[in-house]
Interface confidence: low
């Protein structure tokens, strides 16, 4: 006697998130009469996905017309697949009765969902650091499946090697997240530099996603100070120059002190950028030599980006 078989021809089906998945199922006999139902998983906790008999399944449509008396194709199409749809689906034949009796199950089709990773988000250190220091950048991307993923770091197009990467969770999941921390040694030339986190995944068809961070947000380049005296003018005034060079960011306050007393305070603003992204600033102070009996100690005091002030002093000689 020919026995009813429920055939699910594909052991596995892989679908990209957002697409539709077709799960094929064929029954080899119209007898006995009774509905087909689709479940995800097995045992008492299995989830009903579709029933010919009853219920509302907005994302599921039968491939063939189930009202046809001679229909033996019980394939379904699930629309707008998400990673949460991953699992093993079973096509199950029931014998009509009160209640219906489970008769035969297909071998199951494992649905895996190829979900693209989210755009990598790169975050840098909370506080700025100076050249020669190592700073950490973190890259995160979420929601991808399958778990296999490749992450690379670049600085100005050059691949970095000092980084640690974790993919979570470690076990089986509908989707995964990746987090990577790269250590980057800063140089004074890094104001215009970028770090790039590049994520490659099967869903991206060879086109990696990139997240970027500008090192300008992470670096502080402290200024060089130089105080010089120009030759004395005919009116007994001496021009003293304080050159503040190669600093970043622009946030800088300069104070002139004459013999320890504040003479003038200036704030840097709208400075032209050097080729390397740093800034230069020159401040002048005119000292009336005839107003002084003794040598004048001039101090150029620079407070850069909230850091402790840096001083450079210069003595203006007053001839007897």
């Amino acid at each position: 006697e020919e026995e009813l078989q429920v055939i699910q021809p594909e052991k596995s089906v892989s679908v990209a998130a957002g697409e539709s998945a077709t799960l094929n199922c064929t029954a080899t006999s119209l007898i006995p009469v009774g509905p087909i139902q689709w479940f995800r998983g097995v045992g008492p906790g299995r989830e009903l996905i579709y029933s010919q008999k009853e219920g509302h399944f907005p994302r599921v449509t039968p491939v063939s017309d189930p009202t046809k008396r001679n229909n033996m194709d019980f394939s379904i199409r699930i629309s707008n697949i998400t990673p949460a749809d991953a699992g093993t689906y079973y096509c199950v034949k029931f014998r009509k009765g009160s209640p219906d009796v489970e008769l035969k199950s297909g071998a199951g089709t494992e649905l895996s969902v190829r979900a693209k990773p989210s755009a990598p988000v790169v975050s840098g250190p909370a506080v700025r650091a100076t050249a020669e220091h190592t700073v950490s950048f973190t890259c995160e991307s979420h929601g991808f499946s399958p778990r296999d993923i490749t992450l690379k770091w670049f600085k100005n197009g050059n691949e970095l090697s000092d980084f640690q990467t974790n993919v979570d969770p470690a076990g089986k999941s509908v989707s995964y997240s990746i987090r990577s921390t790269a250590r980057v040694v800063l140089t004074r030339r890094d104001v215009h530099s970028q770090v790039i986190c590049e994520v490659a995944h099967v869903t991206l068809q060879g086109d990696p996603l990139r997240g970027t961070a500008n090192l300008s947000e992470a670096i502080r380049v402290p200024p060089f100070l130089e105080v010089t005296q120009q030759s004395m003018r005919a009116d007994n005034q001496v021009n003293v120059t304080c050159q503040v060079t190669k600093f970043y960011p622009q946030r800088l306050q300069l104070t002139w002190l004459e013999n320890g007393n504040v003479s003038r305070t200036e704030m840097a603003s709208a400075l032209p950028e050097n080729k390397d992204g740093t800034y230069n600033w020159t401040s002048w102070l005119l000292v009336n030599v005839s107003a002084h009996r003794d040598d004048v100690k001039l101090t150029c005091q620079v407070e850069h980006d909230g850091q402790p002030a840096v001083n450079k002093s210069f003595s203006v000689k007053v001839s007897a």
Partner: antibody
Framework: QVQLQESGPGLVKPSQTLSLTCTVS??????????WSWIRQHPGKGLEWIGY???????YYNPSLKSRVTISVDTSKNQFSLKLSSVTAADTAVYYC???????????WGQGTTVTVSS | DIQMTQSPSSLSASVGDRVTITCQAS??????LNWYQQKPGKAPKLLIY???NLATGVPSRFSGSGSGTDFTFTISSLQPEDIATYYC?????????FGGGTKVEIK
């Protein structure tokens, strides 16, 4: 600064292979910008991206041309090349090579070379 | 492939006019969009990268904005030397694709 110069025959017979070379001067093909692209423009039409190559040799081709395209790099000569096989009159176009920086778009282009496919 | 729809395909404006070109992507491309200028017989020239950043040496009358699927390119005050065809280009997904171009002429 970096400059690009396309070279190759201006006339190719149908069914033959179109071969063009882009010479990079003023900088190394191996450093800085990782992508080196070929783009073409049919007469009086818009721009069509053909594909790119990393200095490492990794390539990606436009699926519309993938079966016929090969892009290769010769770092010793500071050049990268385009080969397009089984050409037809529809491949008549101005072919450009360009540098694609990580975040600067295609910021350096060759002046373009006109290739006519005709017997 | 991502489709890039540029409009208008051509426009005519007077010197000093504000000119606006739009570019629409067939799906979200974040801000991965460049704008190019191509003068007759010349290679394209990068004007704007990452949707809104001005390329080196490009006059400030050129600007770009937008994110996701809708982008705008603006010339704040049209100059005679701006006669050209302008293209948008997405680089969010391979293959990279260009808009059909907008030809800008002087009235």
């Amino acid at each position: 600064q970096v400059q690009l110069q396309e070279s190759g025959p201006g006339l190719v017979k149908p069914s033959q292979t179109l071969s063009l070379t882009c010479t990079v001067s003023g900088g190394s093909i191996s450093s800085g910008s990782p992508y080196w692209s070929w783009i073409r423009q049919h007469p009086g039409k818009g721009l069509e991206w053909i594909g790119y190559i990393y200095a490492s040799g990794f390539t990606y081709y436009n699926p519309s041309l993938k079966s016929r395209v090969t892009i290769s790099v010769d770092t010793s000569k500071n050049q990268f090349s385009l080969k397009l096989s089984s050409v037809t009159a529809a491949d008549t176009a101005v072919y450009y090579c360009a540098r694609e920086g990580y975040h600067s778009g295609m910021d350096v282009w060759g002046q373009g070379t006109t290739v006519t496919v005709s017997s | 492939d991502i489709q890039m729809t540029q409009s208008p395909s051509s426009l005519s404006a007077s010197v000093g006019d504000r000119v606006t070109i739009t570019c629409q992507a067939s799906q979200d491309i974040s801000n991965y969009l460049n704008w190019y200028q191509q003068k007759p017989g010349k290679a394209p020239k990068l004007l704007i990268y990452d949707a809104s950043n001005l390329a080196t040496g490009v006059p400030s009358r050129f600007s770009g904005s937008g994110s996701g699927t809708d982008f705008t390119f603006t010339i704040s005050s049209l100059q005679p030397e701006d006669i050209a065809t302008y293209y948008c280009q997405q680089f969010a997904y391979l293959p990279w694709t260009f808009g059909g171009g907008t030809k800008v002429e002087i009235k």
